[in-house]
């Protein structure tokens, strides 16, 4: 498999058959698949060097792994997008052997003197062809030469099989399955041959191709493949339940932010709640996690403005649940990214020198910002797309707080909507879905560069649009939701999560 290890070294060779038998639309589809693969790999913070070859009668090398920009995913994608099927029109035979020899030439080193670290570099060849080679001879001989070069299968104690993966995608109207199978790697419990039909569900294909065991602690990563559970798609999501004898129970959501902490809303708890009465589950697991302590933001005080006629005051409505035992990360349990951390800098593929302010400008620009939250409907987690009103609609969004029960007599809305809040909901630019009571404490998320970054904690809403946890179809335009802006509570997060190795900026 493609081992995505951010500390490892990898070369990926993209080889695309542009011969007559492929056809323009299949060529375009294959290109799209490769573009998606480049993005998927880049989302892991891995920066492999890419080689890019198209071929028919002759190969054309568009990107060499030795080029300085070969590890710049955006640049490689640009080169790939600029390739046309017509480029091989005049010499449109199929010489797969020559194309693989072009890959071999990129792998090999001058004067037979291997560079430092050559033996730690993994090589991945992704060949998109119909397998109908009609000139140049059998391409399998070049695969053998490549194996020889990389010293694969020669040492009984160290076969190095994981240093070469050859994936073959059968593209085109007619595919020679025998030839394709012969070229692809053969490894136990792994799939290295894919058909055109597979390319309709690329996430499923990538799931078969990628080994992310070295990057399970990466924040904001998800798997969207068809066989995945809700928690493959939202692996940070935590369900919180507070059992109160003779008073029923309160349901909330939260987000895994580190191996020991779940971030949620403070209002989910009262000062009387004992740790043993708080149930937290993650990854869709039945068992509850043991809780060490709930840490409230020191400035949170729901009764803080009762004298001023404000019955409930949600400023600083955030809490961290500290778990007794370390979470074991896996594909259904992994953290979400937090603002102003090194992990988020890497997730957004920003320079290491990026400041907290620059992250804020990237994630919360002064405009309508596409975001999402996760809600549970009929025991299924679903993503709800909303827009954070952070530009010209911000004022009107915040003013609608006056329609919230108990806030009708508030003279100045900034008394309840403090600078700590982000506002979503309403009908412009689109009709946003609203949060339900049980969504409280869950993350408000910005999805960027294939990663998920939490920017807010769901706190309170103007209108209860959910009857029995079912959203009403028709909701008033003033149905707004307010979320604690994590950029505004960073000092507290930084202090409480200082031992969690999140690398706060």
């Amino acid at each position: 498999k493609i081992v995505l290890d951010p500390s490892g070294s990898m070369n990926i060779y993209l080889v695309l058959d542009g011969s007559d038998s492929i056809g323009a639309s299949n060529f375009t589809g294959a290109k799209k698949c490769l573009v998606n693969l480049i993005e998927k790999v880049a989302s892991y913070g891995v920066k492999p060097r890419y080689g890019l070859v198209t071929y028919a009668t002759y190969p054309k090398i568009w990107v060499k792994v030795s080029e300085a920009d070969s590890s710049n995913a955006d640049w490689v994608t640009k080169q790939l997008n600029e390739i046309n099927y017509e480029d091989h029109k005049l010499k449109s035979g199929t010489n797969t052997k020559k194309a693989l020899q072009a890959v071999y030439s990129m792998m090999s080193w001058p004067d037979d003197v291997p560079p430092e670290g050559w033996n730690r570099t993994r090589h991945v060849i992704i060949l998109m062809t119909d397998g109908l080679h009609n000139m140049g001879g059998d391409p399998i001989t070049v695969i053998d030469e490549i194996r020889d070069l990389l010293y694969i299968g020669k040492d009984r104690k160290n076969p190095r099989e994981d240093y070469l993966d050859v994936y073959v995608f059968g593209v085109g109207p007619l595919v020679n399955q025998v030839n394709i199978n012969a070229l692809a790697s053969k490894k136990d419990n792994e799939q290295h041959v894919f058909k055109v039909k597979d390319m309709e569900n690329l996430e499923d294909v990538f799931y078969q191709m990628i080994d992310e065991s070295q990057s399970l602690s990466l924040c904001g990563m998800v798997w969207e493949h068809r066989k995945g559970t809700d928690y493959h798609k939202q692996p940070w999501q935590a369900k919180i339940s507070v059992i109160r004898p003779s008073k029923g129970h309160e349901s909330c959501m939260g987000a895994v932010v580190s191996e020991y902490f779940v971030l949620t809303a403070a209002h989910c708890f009262t000062v009387d709640d004992k740790e043993h009465s708080i149930k937290v589950s993650v990854g869709g697991e039945k068992r509850d996690l043991e809780i060490e302590v709930v840490l409230f933001h020191p400035n949170y005080n729901i009764n803080g403005k009762k004298e001023a006629g404000i019955p409930e005051f949600y400023d600083y409505d955030v809490a961290l649940i500290k778990l007794k035992n370390k979470l074991k990360y896996g594909q259904t349990i992994r953290p979400i990214c937090l603002p102003c951390t090194e992990g988020t800098t890497r997730a957004l593929r920003l320079p290491p020198t990026t400041t907290c302010q620059q992250q804020k400008e990237e994630l919360l620009p002064a405009q309508d910002i596409k975001a999402l939250f996760v809600s549970e409907e009929e025991k299924k987690l679903t993503r709800k797309e909303v827009y954070i009103k952070n530009g010209d609609k911000k004022g009107s969004c915040e003013r609608d707080a006056q329609y919230a029960p108990g806030y009708d007599k508030v003279k100045d809305i900034s008394e309840v909507v403090t600078p700590r809040f982000l506002c979503t909901g309403g009908v412009s630019p689109y009709a946003d879905p609203n949060t339900c009571r049980g969504d409280s404490g869950g993350p408000l998320i910005v999805h960027k560069r294939s990663r998920f970054i939490q920017v807010g904690v769901i706190s309170w809403g103007v209108v209860d649009v959910c009857k029995n946890q079912k959203r009403q179809k028709q909701v008033p335009a003033h149905a707004r939701d307010f979320h604690i802006n994590l950029f505004q509570v960073l000092p507290w997060l930084k202090e409480k999560l200082q031992d969690e190795d999140l690398g706060f900026l």
């Epitope: 033996n119 010293y151 040492d155 009984r156 104690k157």
Partner: antibody
Framework: EVQLVESGGGLVQPGGSLRLSCGTT????????MSWVRQAPGKGLEWLGF??????????EYAASVKGRFTISRDNSKNTLYLQMNSLKTEDTAVYYC????????????WGQGTLVTVSS | EIVLTQSPATLSLSPGERATLGCKAS??????????MNWYQQKPGQAPRLLIY???NLESGIPARFSGSGSGTDFTLTISSLEPEDFAVYYC?????????FGQGTKLEIK
């Protein structure tokens, strides 16, 4: 055809030095471990050390009895293995063999004919 | 280091007889499903010759009357029917752990 030929043996005084060479042909030298083995008169075989193949950067390994006194090196451009022997003792008198150590099964599948080293005053 | 003890030190047999040579290791020479034990034959004035590798695999060009068996710490070289040219010294050698080591040898002589 695989061939290994040792050279450089001879008479040397105790405390002296000697460098043995092992020229090879018929195989891709850099892809193999290469070992030195010796045999004292009337005694058994004693493994002295090897030079690993290219994946391991040709790093050497030594038997405790010669560590610090003997050095194994190779010149891949000349397909030649070397054994530099320093501070020689009378008990180092032996026939010295070089052998190709096949990493496909970690066994010495080809041997040279041997070269005699006599340490005597 | 792994110490290899061969038995017997000397074995006197006649041509046509079956020879069984033993080799015991001070610790296991198995790794990842393979036994890294090799057998060599040496005749006077000649370099050793590989007979068996990885405990039971016959090196190419070696007659089929030679066979090897065993795993872990106990290994056997068997010559099913001795030919006159088989009388020589036989060494076992382990390549599982560095440093490699040889047994002291078994001398197979004509009775």
């Amino acid at each position: 055809e695989v061939q290994l030929v040792e050279s450089g043996g001879g008479l040397v005084q105790p405390g002296g030095s000697l460098r043995l060479s092992c020229g090879t042909t018929g195989f891709t030298f850099r892809d193999y471990y290469m070992s030195w083995v010796r045999q004292a008169p009337g005694k058994g075989l004693e493994w002295l050390g090897f030079s690993r193949h290219r994946v391991y950067g040709y790093t050497p390994e030594y038997a405790a009895s010669v560590k610090g006194r003997f050095t194994i090196s190779r010149d891949n451009s000349k397909n030649t293995l070397y054994l530099q022997m320093n501070s020689l003792k009378t008990e180092d008198t032996a026939v010295y063999y070089c052998a190709r150590d096949n990493p496909g099964y970690y066994a010495m599948d080809y041997w040279g004919q041997g070269t005699l080293v006599t340490v005597s005053s | 280091e792994i110490v290899l003890t061969q038995s017997p030190a000397t074995l006197s047999l006649s041509p046509g007889e079956r020879a069984t040579l033993g080799c015991k290791a001070s610790q296991s020479v198995d790794y990842d499903g393979d036994s890294y034990m090799n057998w060599y034959q040496q005749k006077p004035g000649q370099a050793p010759r590989l007979l068996i590798y990885a405990a039971s695999n016959l090196e190419s060009g070696i007659p089929a009357r030679f066979s090897g068996s065993g795993s872990g710490t106990d290994f056997t070289l068997t010559i099913s029917s001795l030919e006159p040219e088989d009388f020589a010294v036989y060494y076992c050698q382990q390549s599982n752990a560095d440093p490699y080591t040889f047994g002291q040898g078994t001398k197979l002589e004509i009775k």
